[in-house]
């Protein structure tokens, strides 16, 4: 339910004895009260009251969820993947219905050479985890397969996803024109045929932190912004301190609303602070400023 | 589990004729692949020759002509003619049996491996 809260004022004193004055509520935004029972727990933007506090939903907090926090948790994936279906011809072997059947002593076979030879293929590429046979079919041996590929998250790893494809494109076009087979003879652990080699579709890891941070903040989306630290995206807003896009207030305090960060000045006993930064000084006795 | 165990290796004269066996535990393979390869000392395994359930058969360049490999399915049993042999066909002379109709002579390619037997041809 829709509820009127009257709007106090909240009076914060610094460590050097000086007081902010704010509007606890932003008066031109609709609160949403959670009432349990005869208990109204005044839990605002869709937090609920658990019979001891307010559990608010991200990004807020405080007592009555009316804060928004500085920071909000993301986690990108530990691992990125990406997966390339492939097809390739294999001369060395004939086709047999028992290769239909995946738990046929044939398949088992197959399955173990293949996974041998394509090991071998891309033994060079570090984000090979391995293949994964789909289907076999006739014309000697026609095998579709997955090609795995994993690397660690990183803001790049779209780059080295698609850098690793490509060599995997690269080493079967090779192994698949080098091994083949001379006078109805392999002499190699498989032979192929050069013009069967086909790569259907890769699909890779789609994580984009900065939608992740965006689909977070919800109305505040516009405000918040990624920035990295250690390979690391943190999903933050201006009012959260070391970071490029950090507001600096001063003399003041920083706080997010829905029209973005804004800087509450400190009044000391002996200056009002003013100014968007809350930078420009006057002085009280003698009404001088300092910049 | 599948057995496999070669044997009739000796010793033979250059120019001498020797014929080797391989005995299959059961006729699992009668429907994929047997074959024959040999290991000189000192030297890699290499094939020697190969027979498929389709009828296919395949020799090593350096024993074509002299050497014919044969299968005797009602006796789960592998064959290897050597005729005109000659110093360098002296080595261990293994069987090797696959599921797969294959067409390889390479031994990686092959999963099941029987006991060798010696060969040494010598004046």
């Known amino acids: 339910p829709l509820a009127t809260i009257p709007v106090s004022t909240t009076s914060l004193t610094s460590s050097e004895g000086s007081t902010i004055s704010t509007p606890s509520v932003d008066i031109s935004t609709p609160v949403t009260t959670s009432i349990v029972g005869d208990q109204c727990s005044r839990c605002k933007n869709g937090g609920f009251w658990d019979g001891l506090k307010c559990q608010c939903l991200t990004p807020y907090y405080g007592e009555s969820c009316e804060e928004v926090v500085n920071s909000i948790d993301i986690a990108p994936p530990e691992t990125v993947s990406a997966q390339m279906e492939l097809t390739v011809t294999v001369t060395s072997v004939k086709f047999t219905d028992e290769l239909k059947n995946h738990s046929s002593q044939e398949f088992r076979e197959f399955n173990k050479t293949f996974t041998e030879q394509m090991n071998i293929v891309y033994s060079g590429i570090p984000e090979y985890v391995g293949v994964n046979i789909t289907n076999l079919r006739l014309g000697s041996v026609v095998v579709e397969h997955d090609v795995l590929l994993r690397t660690k998250y990183t803001p790049e790893y779209k780059t080295a996803l698609d850098n690793a494809t490509e060599v995997v494109k690269q080493k079967i076009t090779k192994v698949t024109t080098e091994q083949i087979m001379t006078n109805d003879n392999c002499s190699a652990l498989m032979c192929f045929n050069t013009t069967g080699t086909q790569v259907q579709n890769i699909t890779v890891t789609q994580y984009d932190p900065v939608e992740e941070c965006r689909q977070k903040a919800e109305e505040y989306e516009d405000y918040f912004l990624v920035e990295y630290r250690d390979q690391k995206p943190y999903c933050i807003s201006p009012c959260e301190s070391g970071f490029n896009a950090s507001k600096n207030c001063n003399h003041g305090k920083c706080q997010m609303s829905q029209n973005g960060a804004r800087c509450l000045c400190v009044t000391t006993e002996t200056h009002w602070y003013s100014g968007e930064d809350c930078n420009q000084g006057t002085q009280k006795s003698h009404h001088h400023h300092h910049h | 589990d599948v057995q496999l165990q070669a044997s009739g290796g000796g010793l033979v004269q250059p120019g001498g004729s020797l014929r080797l066996s391989c005995a299959a535990s059961?006729?699992?393979?009668?429907?994929?692949?047997m074959s024959w390869f040999r290991q000189a000392p000192g030297k890699e395994r290499e094939g020697v020759a190969i027979i498929s359930s389709d009828g296919w058969t395949g020799y090593a360049d350096s024993v074509k002509g002299r050497f014919t490999i044969s299968q005797d399915n009602a006796k789960n049993s592998l064959y290897l003619q050597m005729n005109s042999l000659r110093a360098e066909d002296t080595a261990v002379y293994y069987c090797?049996?696959?599921?797969?109709?294959?067409?390889?002579?390479?031994?990686?390619?092959?999963?099941?491996w029987g006991q060798g037997t010696m060969v040494t041809v010598s004046s």
């Open positions: 059961d006729n699992t393979f009668s429907r994929g692949s």
């Open positions: 090797a049996a696959s599921f797969l109709v294959l067409r390889a002579l390479n031994p990686k390619a092959w999963h099941y």
